[in-house]
Structures are given as structure tokens and as C-alpha cells.
Interface confidence: low
Amino acid sequence: ATPEPCQIDDEDVRCVCNFTHPQPDWSSALQCVAAVEVEIRGGGRSLEEFLLKSASANPKQYADMLKALRLRRLTVGAARVPAQILALVLHALGFSRLKELTLEDLEVTGQVPPPLQETPGPALTTLRLRNVSWATGGAWLGELQQWLQPSLKVLKVAQASSLAFPCAQLRAFPALTTLDLSDNPGLGERGLTAALCPRKFPALEDLALRNAGMETPSGVCAALAGAGVQPHRLDLSHNSLRATAAGARECVWPAALSSLNLSFAELEQVPKGLPPKLTVLDLSCNKLNRAPRPEELPAVDDLTLEGNPYMDPEALQHQEDPMA
């Protein structure tokens, strides 16, 4: 006997579905209706079979049932999803009280149609996307945004196929405080400039760019200045950073910036042109082979330097003598 594709825990909190069977029993998902957190994986299959069934579907007739769901967090993954199906799901979720939506390992085919005026989508606070490809390239964010109420606080996009957003088609994200573009190693500073559409992220406080192909702190500074964003905290850890190239223009960092993470950045010296004043600066786990001089560092309340060779004489010796 094949195992049930969906499993719900004893307290009806979390329900996980893995539809890996060639003829999956989709009705198994009905046991998830009581759950707060639902994870559905499609086994890499195409959901095109639902297109015909969905043609006449009207989520409004199920509005009361959808409103009564305990569902707060939903993950959908491992499938090829026609854009019309995605639109229908977002329409239906607009009647629910969903707060967090995660899409991962998806291929969205076709263009997401715009919603009708009277049907707002879900009032999400968090949207996460990982390894999602879109037929419409960088236009995907604008297409998705049309379906979301302006409540989004956290947007995390990893392993994206395109982050070059057509800025003219985007509305502002008035509540967005966290933008995480980590794990996009092909992004780079030029890509960051394209992704940070001016005046679209007025409330941004946290910007995470771990493993995002960043090259110099001053290049990131220039991208932030060009977009006019004012993050309080910036995470550039896990990038291979260079000290600013000679002749680079001086850049004025956002005045609000108080915390900068440059850990695991392969830095051999403290980069030039850091913000003059910070509350927190993390330079841990780099390749600094001498203690930074006070004039190299900004005025900082909380400085972390652990894990650099100069603090470990043995590691420094290995670095200087590669045969050791």
C-alpha cells in the first residue's frame, strides 16, 4: 500500500504533503484543512491538469469556508505551475487569513493575469521565494504584487532567475521592512542597482545580501544611494569582498545605517570608505592578518573581530608558509 501523501501532526498544527506518486491522491490534502502550517510539494509534476477543472472555479463561493481556515503559513514547492492556477490560488487565499507564503522549486508558466478590482489577494506579511523561475522574467514581482495587499513586511528571494525588475510597473511596498536577496550569487552590484527600484521600498530597515556576488562595500553603497533606500542594517557577509578599488568615487552611506555585517567576506584589510559611524560592525572570520588601526575603523560601539588570522598566531603562520 502506498503511504498517505499528506501527514498532519497530532495537534493539527503542521500538515506536510508530498505528491510524488505517479497518480497522486490529491484528496489527501483535505486532511490539512485544520492545520495552521501547510507544506505541499508536487513531486516536480506539472499542475496543468487542473487548468480545465479551474476554468469554472469561483473561490468566492467558498469564501466563508476559506475565512474559517486556521491556515497562517503555506509552502508550495516542486511543481510546474500555470500562471492562471497561481492566480486562482492567490484569489482564494485572499479570503483566508494567510500570513506567510513560501514558493520554492517552482516553474511558473505563462503570465500571471491581473486580479479583478473587487478581489484583493492575501494580506501577507512574509513572502519567500527560492528557486522559482518565471516565464515573464523580471516582470514577476509586479505581477505578484497586483495580487497582494500592501501589508508585506518581509520579502526574501533566493536563487532567482531574474531580479531585474521593471521599476515603472512596480507600486511601492509601503510596509516592507526586510528585503533579503541572499543566495543570488549572480546578482552583483549592477544587479542590485536594477533590483532596488527607487522610491519602491520607503520603509526598508533590513537589507540582506549574503552570498549575492557583491564585490566592494563602496559598490553596494553606490547602489543604495542610487535607489535612495535607507536601511538600518546591512548584511554583506559571505561575499568575496575586495577593499575598494583605487580611484573609486567616495560614496555617502545612508544616514540611518547603524549595523554592517562583513563577516566571512575574505577581507584581507579593512575596506576603505566604510560609514563613519556605526553601532555594530562585524568583521569576524575574515583574513585580516593584523589588528585594524583605530583610524581604519569607523566609530563603532560593538565591533567583532573573532576568527581573523592575526588573533590566532598558528593560523597566521600557516597563511605565511603555505608548505606548513
Epitope: 501532526d9 495537534e11 503542521r14 506567510e100 513560501t102 506579511t125 512574509t126 521592512t177
Partner: antibody
Amino acid sequence: QVRLQQPGAELVRPGASVKLSCKASGYTFTTYWMNWVKQRPEDGLEWIGRIDPYDSETHYNQNFKDKAILTVDKSSSTAYMQLSSLTYEDSAVYYCTRKEGRQWGAYFDYWGQGTTLTVSS
Amino acid sequence: DIVMTQSQKFMSTSVGDRVSVTCKASQYVGTNVAWYQQKPGQSPKALIQSASYRCSGVPDRFTGSGSGTDFTLTISNVQSEDLADYFCQQYNTYVTFGGGTKLELK
């Protein structure tokens, strides 16, 4: 840096109520669930419940649903826990702790220093 | 409720030793397990999350392993500052903690 500030101690009479506070700073208060944990030497650590400061959604441990009420004041970035009908068994250290932001629940990445509650006549 | 059992309440060790603290969940919790260290008069501090990922700033002598129902925290080359209480925690369904294991000197 992230800080969760709690008063060091509270002394209350049996049968009374108390409202413990936890002031958050150094991060966006409304982005992370705030949890409360009870610790007594004989019982170890017990999770009481959590609150989403964004919209005050709460989840409680069933053992505390008639004992604790969690609230927040977004304007001051402060979380509160009110404990009612206090008995000697409520004497403990109470910690507020921030839930790291992963989706299916998450570990607690920052903890307050704890408030020692003593119930005594 | 999911019960997290730390069968050893006390463990004796010496500086430089390798020690393993174990924790068993009463039902499947995937890798949704964290380990915390608590020293007298202090708050717990997260060491390991998602069963095997070291938290920021935690020395690499601390390693976590396991999935499903059986989990282990291993401290290699124990230092005197590692003498403390260690708690496991599951966060697969709400939150429950183990009863703790006190690491003390032989």
C-alpha cells in the same frame, strides 16, 4: 544590537496578578514572534506561549492558557505577560525570548535576562 | 505534547575530553531541534539550530547531529567554560524542552 530588557524581580501575594514586561530594541519589533518561557529548578524550561507583535496573534501551551495572557505595545516595542491567580508554583524565572524568523516555528536566538517572580505571603 | 527526554541528568567530564549529550523526542520532529547552554545565573544561549547548524559565534567544538527522534550534542575538547546545563528543544509542533543535562568536572 538586539536587546530584550526585563525587570530583575517581582514579589507578589498569592491570588494576585502580575504583568511582566519585556522591552525589545535593536531590531524591527513587529517582524519576530516573541515567546515566554518559565524556568523552575524542579521543572526545567517550559514554553508558555508566543505572540506575533504585528497583529497580536497568540499561541499558548495548553498548560498555561488559563494562567497567562500575552500582549504587546507596538509603540514602545514592549511585550507583556500577565499571570493571574498566582500560587506558590508560579514562583519561577520568566524569560522573554525572540523566535528566529524561520517558517515552521524556530529556535530562540535572543533571550532576556529573566524576571524572578516570587509568590509569597 | 511532544516530550523531549534527556536521560542523563548529570555527566562528568575532564578538560580536553569529548562528551556527547543525547536527547530523544517522543515523536518525529524532523530536524527542528535546537540545543541551548545555560550557565548559573544566566539566560540560555542558543548553540545549535536545525539539529546540526551552529549558531553565530559558537565555537566549532560544539556539533549537533540527528534527525527524526534521536539527537546528539557533542563537545570535543571540553573547556572549563563549557561546564553548564544543556537543554534540547523541539520546535516542530509548538515548543517543548528537554529536562536538561548538567556537565560537571570529574
